[in-house]
Interface confidence: medium
C-alpha cells in the first residue's frame, strides 16, 4: 500500500496577521513528506508546498486573491517513495489517495489578526494634538499595488487612542474611523500615546495589541505655538 507508515497531520492551525497567512501543523515528518491543498468553497483544489518536510505552508498568495472568500485547506501525508518520482502527483503507485487532514475553514477578512499598529507622528498646535497612525501595508493587491489596512477594511476598522499626562497614570481614550486623532491637551503638559486597532463588528480577533508608547518631547513629535 502507498500509505504505509504515514501519519496524518494534526493540530492544523491558521496563523494570520494583516493577511500574511501560514498554515501550521504537527508532527515533524519521519517516513513521509507533506503537500498542502487550498481551495475556495466553489473552486478546485490547488496544491502548494509540494513534498515539503516543513510543518508549515505560506498560503498568503492564495488568500489575498479574495480576502472575503471562505477558504478550505488540507494537508496530505505522502510516503517517501511516492514523493521521489519527481512528478507533482499526490497519489501512490496504486492510485490510492494518501491520508489527509482538513483545516478549519478560513475567512481572511474575519479571521486575520490585526497587527500591532504604529504611531507615525504627532503634532501639537496650542492645546490640540494631532496623532497619526501609520496605515500599514498588507499583502493584498489591487491593480498591481499593495493595499493598506484601511484600503481593505474601510470603515470597519477603527483606532482607539489611549493618552495620558506623563506625570500621571490616568488614561483617556479617543476613537477614530480614519487614521488620525485630534485631541485636546493642557498647554505645557507632556502626554504619552498608544493606539490599538479594532474591528467592532467582529466577535473574535477584534483588537490588536497596543502600539509602542510614544511620548511628547521625543523625536516623533512636532510642536507649534
Amino acid at each position: 500500500s502507498g500509505t504505509t507508515n504515514t501519519v496524518a497531520a494534526y493540530n492544523l492551525t491558521w496563523k494570520s496577521t494583516n493577511f500574511k497567512t501560514i498554515l501550521e501543523w504537527e508532527p515533524k515528518p519521519v517516513n513521509q513528506v507533506y503537500t498542502v491543498q487550498i481551495s475556495t468553497k466553489s473552486g478546485d483544489w490547488k496544491s502548494k508546498c509540494f513534498y515539503t518536510t516543513d510543518t508549515e505552508c505560506d498560503l498568503t498568495d492564495e488568500i489575498v486573491k479574495d480576502v472575503k472568500q471562505t477558504y478550505l485547506a488540507r494537508v496530505f501525508s505522502v510516503p517517501w517513495r511516492n514523493s521521489t518520482h519527481g512528478k507533482e502527483t499526490l497519489f501512490g503507485t496504486h492510485g490510492e489517495e494518501p491520508p489527509f487532514t482538513n483545516a478549519r475553514k478560513f475567512l481572511p477578512y474575519r479571521d486575520t489578526k490585526l497587527g500591532q499598529p504604529t504611531i507615525q507622528s504627532f503634532e501639537q498646535v496650542g492645546t490640540k494634538v494631532n496623532v497619526t497612525v501609520e496605515d500599514e501595508r498588507t499583502l493584498v493587491r489591487r491593480n498591481n499595488t499593495f493595499l493598506s489596512l484601511r484600503d481593505v477594511f474601510g470603515k470597519d476598522l477603527i483606532y482607539t487612542l489611549y493618552y495620558w499626562k506623563s506625570s500621571s497614570s490616568g488614561k483617556k481614550t479617543a476613537k477614530t474611523n480614519t487614521n488620525e486623532f485630534l485631541i485636546d491637551v493642557d498647554k505645557g503638559e507632556n502626554y504619552c500615546f498608544s493606539v490599538q486597532a479594532v474591528i467592532p463588528s467582529r466577535t473574535v480577533n477584534r483588537k490588536s495589541t497596543d502600539s509602542p508608547v510614544e511620548c511628547m518631547g521625543q523625536e516623533k513629535g512636532e510642536f507649534r505655538e
Epitope: 519521519v30 518536510t53 516543513d54 505560506d58 517517501w80
Partner: antibody, heavy 125, light 108 residues
Framework: QVQLQESGPGLVKPSQTLSLTCTVS?????????WSWIRQHPGKGLEWIGE???????RYNPSLKSRVTISVDTSKNQFSLKLSSVTAADTAVYYC??????????????????WGKGTTVTVSS | EIVLTQSPGTLSLSPGERATLSCRAS???????LAWYQQKPGQAPRLLIY???SRATGIPDRFSGSGSGTDFTLTISRLEPEDFAVYYC?????????FGGGTKVEIK
C-alpha cells in the same frame, strides 16, 4: 562548523523579563533547522522551553507558554528568548541548541546536535 | 506530555565494566525522535545517539542504543574514565519535548 553562543544579563529581578539571545556562527539560521531553548535548574535535569523555525513559527512548552516568546532575526543570524514575570524558580543555566532534521534511508531523524555553552541566569532582588 | 523515566538514578561501576541505562516512555515514541545525551559538570549536553540506535559523528563504538516503542536502552560496552557523567534520553516527537531525569554513571 556551526557554533552557538548565548548572551544576556546574568541577573534579573523578580517580576521582570528575562531576555537572552543566541548567535549562530559558521552557518545560516535559515538552513532548515529548528532552534531551541533548554534550561537546567541547579543540580537538576533538562527542561525544553521551546523552539523556532527560521520562518518564525514556534512551538512552546505548555508549562511556560503564557510567559515565553521566542523570536528569530535572520538578518543577524540570531534567535532570542524572552521569559516574563520571572521568579526565583526561573534561576537556571539556559542553553540554546540546534534541532536538526537528518535524512537517512527514506526517513527523517531529529536531534539536538549543536549546543551553546550555556549562560547562568539568577533571579534575585 | 510524554514522561521519560530513566533507571537507575545512579550507576556505580568501575572502568572496563559494562553500563546499561534504561529509558522508559509513558507512551510510544517513534525511534526517529529518540536521542541520548551525555553531560559532564559545567558543560552542555553532548549528542551521543539519535534515532534510538544511530551513533552521532565522533562517538566511539563502545556506545550503542537500542529499543523501540516505550523501552529504550543505552549501553556502554567498556567504561572509559571519560565516560563517567550524567546521561539523558530525550524525545522530540510530541510537544512538549521532554528529557528523562538522567542517570549518573559514577566511579565505584
Amino acid at each position: 562548523q556551526v557554533q552557538l553562543q548565548e548572551s544576556g544579563p546574568g541577573l534579573v529581578k523578580p517580576s521582570q523579563t528575562l531576555s537572552l539571545t543566541c548567535t549562530v556562527s559558521g552557518g545560516s539560521i535559515s538552513s532548515g533547522q529548528y532552534w531551541s531553548w533548554i534550561r537546567q535548574h541547579p543540580g537538576k535535569g533538562l527542561e525544553w522551553i521551546g523552539e523556532i523555525y527560521y520562518s518564525g513559527s514556534t512551538r512552546y512548552n505548555p508549562s511556560l507558554k503564557s510567559r515565553v516568546t521566542i523570536s528569530v532575526d535572520t538578518s543577524k543570524n540570531q534567535f532570542s528568548l524572552k521569559l516574563s514575570s520571572v521568579t526565583a524558580a526561573d534561576t537556571a543555566v539556559y542553553y540554546c541548541a540546534r534541532d536538526t532534521p537528518y535524512y537517512y534511508d527514506g526517513g527523517y531523524y531529529y536531534y539536538m546536535d549543536v549546543w551553546g555553552k550555556g549562560t547562568t541566569v539568577t533571579v534575585s532582588s | 506530555e510524554i514522561v521519560l523515566t530513566q533507571s537507575p538514578g545512579t550507576l556505580s561501576l568501575s572502568p572496563g565494566e559494562r553500563a546499561t541505562l534504561s529509558c522508559r516512555a509513558s507512551q510510544s515514541v517513534s525511534s526517529s525522535y529518540l536521542a541520548w545525551y551525555q553531560q559532564k559538570p559545567g558543560q552542555a549536553p553532548r549528542l551521543l545517539i539519535y534515532g534510538a540506535s544511530s551513533r552521532a559523528t565522533g562517538i566511539p563504538d563502545r556506545f550503542s542504543g537500542s529499543g523501540s516503542g516505550t523501552d529504550f536502552t543505552l549501553t556502554i560496552s567498556r567504561l572509559e574514565p571519560e565516560d563517567f557523567a550524567v546521561y539523558y534520553c530525550q524525545q522530540v516527537g510530541v510537544v512538549p519535548y521532554t528529557f528523562g531525569g538522567g542517570t549518573k554513571v559514577e566511579i565505584k
